[in-house]
């Protein structure tokens, strides 16, 4: 039997989303203008390509990566696109208001679009923990709160700790992971009888999730290098990320086989573990002085990811109600922490190697940054979770979790489409 979109949400969603879009258009009209300078066109194209890579990662990579549910694949891809589109608009405005606004108007450049896409990516990472359990109206709230929280976190870190764009954006991994996990913790957890099959993965959606993983794998070097200030740092970041993700693929596939009693390879492990190296080197990708270090980090990250995928889902499912295939949240939380630890270790080595003093102070600052990112993620995530539980959003009933038919019109309704 087909399940119609609840009448109340049908009234609430278009009104809420279109009102918000109208408000964004007005804000853009009054407060923004394009960078008027005449740049070298070839340079602009090269700069745009980085932004394009990030958009591909977000729309195709993360969109398809989260589409492995048997009966929630359409919603995963389309809702991701919806959140990306909304998130980028709000992030451009927010970043402009926080950094440029005293001068009058927000100047939009290719860089601001790049930055906004990366901010929106945070939501797409977080939402993996709650997709299937929320409707679009709730996702709009999640986008607004998370992008705002991340923007403010980045501004606070920049002002207090004096870090550059790359460093304060690379907290995105732990921020997004802990934000998503704390939102999931607030949502109703138990899956009622008879709906367990919906959060299982199916072959074709799993293939599309693998496609998403491949896109992310290909473009991760662009993500890790996008905000670095000089070509030499970008080159180092690209190389180190590439080596790390290459090794994490090998580790993911072989580790997955090793973890299975019959030596079978798990699709779910591979989906997430292929990206492990990219997350783990993110913070320090420009600082790693030689390829073998990046490769070792990729190996460790791959093993952690496979180990996590094997042992953590049970715990996450019980405590947070996160399905077995939605492992991005805890994966990124572990790997993001690993990346931050590696950064601190490199900082110490660099400080000692250069004969500098104040090692303890520098380490303390880095730990302070990380702690602040986690605290703000948890607090804003809990706030979002509480907001999403409000009755006004007409959240899908637990019996309708992970069900495309709640949201989509299908020409012929069949189970397992």
């Amino acid at each position: 039997m087909s399940s119609k979109y609840p009448r109340s949400v049908r009234r609430c969603l278009p009104l809420w989303a279109l009102t918000l879009e109208a408000a964004l258009i007005l804000l853009f009209y009054f407060f923004t203008h394009y960078d008027a300078s005449l740049e070298d066109q070839k340079g602009l194209v090269a700069s745009y390509q980085v932004g394009q890579d990030l958009t591909v990662m977000a729309a195709i990579g993360l969109g398809f990566l989260t589409s492995s549910f048997r009966r929630h694949s359409w919603s995963s891809v389309a809702f991701n696109l919806f959140m990306l589109a909304l998130g980028v608009q709000w992030a451009i405005l927010l970043d402009g208001f926080l950094s440029q606004f005293p001068s009058g108007k927000v100047v939009i450049t290719l860089f601001s679009i790049r930055l906004a896409t990366m901010s929106a990516l945070s939501v797409l990472i977080s939402v993996d923990a709650v997709l299937g359990k929320v409707n679009l109206a709730q996702l709009v709230v999640m986008v607004l709160v998370e992008v705002t929280a991340l923007g403010n976190l980045r501004m606070v870190i920049s002002n207090i700790f004096n870090t550059d764009y790359h460093m304060n954006m690379m907290h995105i991994y732990v921020f997004a992971a802990y934000f998503g996990l704390s939102v999931a913790w607030c949502l109703p957890k138990p899956l009622p009888e008879g709906t367990e099959d919906k959060d299982q993965t199916a072959t074709i959606p799993s293939l599309s999730a693998m496609l998403g993983a491949l896109f992310l794998w290909m473009f991760w070097p662009s993500f890790n290098s996008a905000l670095l200030r000089s070509p030499i740092e970008r080159k180092n970041a690209v190389f180190n990320t590439y080596y790390a993700v290459a090794v994490s693929v090998v580790t993911a596939i072989s580790g997955s086989s090793l973890a299975h009693p019959q030596g079978k390879i798990s699709k779910t492990y591979v989906h997430s573990a292929v990206l492990a190296g990219g997350v783990a080197v993110g913070t320090s990708c420009h600082l790693i002085p030689s390829p073998w270090l990046a490769m070792v980090l990729g190996l460790v990250a791959g093993l952690i990811s496979v180990g996590g995928a094997k042992y953590l889902p049970g715990c996450c499912n019980r405590v947070l109600g996160i399905p077995h295939s939605s492992i991005m949240g805890y994966n990124f939380s572990l790997l993001g922490l690993l990346g931050e630890i590696i950064y601190i270790v490199l900082l110490v080595l660099d400080t000692v190697g250069a004969g500098n003093g104040m090692i303890g102070f520098q380490v303390l600052l880095s730990i302070g940054e990380l702690s602040l990112a986690i605290v703000i993620a948890l607090m804003s995530g809990l706030l979002t979770g509480l907001l999403l539980n409000l009755k006004i959003w007409k959240a899908p009933h637990e019996a309708k979790y992970f069900d495309d038919q709640v949201f989509w019109k299908f020409p012929h309704l069949a189970v397992g489409f």
């Epitope: 860089f111 420009h286 002085p289």
Partner: antibody, heavy 127, light 106 residues
Amino acid sequence: EVQLLEESGGGVVQPGRSLRLACAASGFSFRSYGMHWVRQAPGRGLEWVAFTWFDGSNKYYVDSVKGRFTISRDNSKNTLYLEMNSLRVDDTAVYYCAREAPMLRGISRYYYAMDVWGPGTTVTVSS
Amino acid sequence: AELTQSPSSLSASVGDRVTITCRASQNIRRSLNWYQQKPGKAPKLLIYAASSLQSGVPSRFSGSGSGTDFTLTISSLQPEDFATYYCQQSSNTPWTFGQGTKVEIK
């Protein structure tokens, strides 16, 4: 090869008018470096004005010139520009362009410094 | 981060040891550079990353410090060292210079 920067476009201009400074680079790969404009009012210290990333994708300005000055670059012509609108008397200064270089220190950490400077061009805003 | 240099001027003789300090209003780690400027000329980079000597700069110049307090030292002042010295931070936007220290002949 000698690494050089040469500013041009300075002159005397009335308040409220516009001026465009240019900085021609030679002897190095211009497209690989961030570039700054720094000014020095008569008898005063150095004041940073604007900065653009190596690819022109990101720009920064000191608060006093935001909305009036625009920094840009043409990597195909190895040239940096500073478009100055609504000029004020307190914009009178010698304007220098400077190259920002990543300087390796320790194992792998890069720090940034202005290692090549032009001789400067004088901008006088007076009625 | 605002930079405060001290002293604003000093008189010294050839062969003297000269120390100039620069204090940042917030932690800038080691992102501090020192420049020398002679009248009518462009500034010249002396020290980057708080303590690294730029190539071609005599070893009598040295820098130290981290966080908020930095020092430029000229171990034995030479006639060509009489100039104005500026500290500059590259940690975060807006990049800022100290107000300068003029080293004059006693």
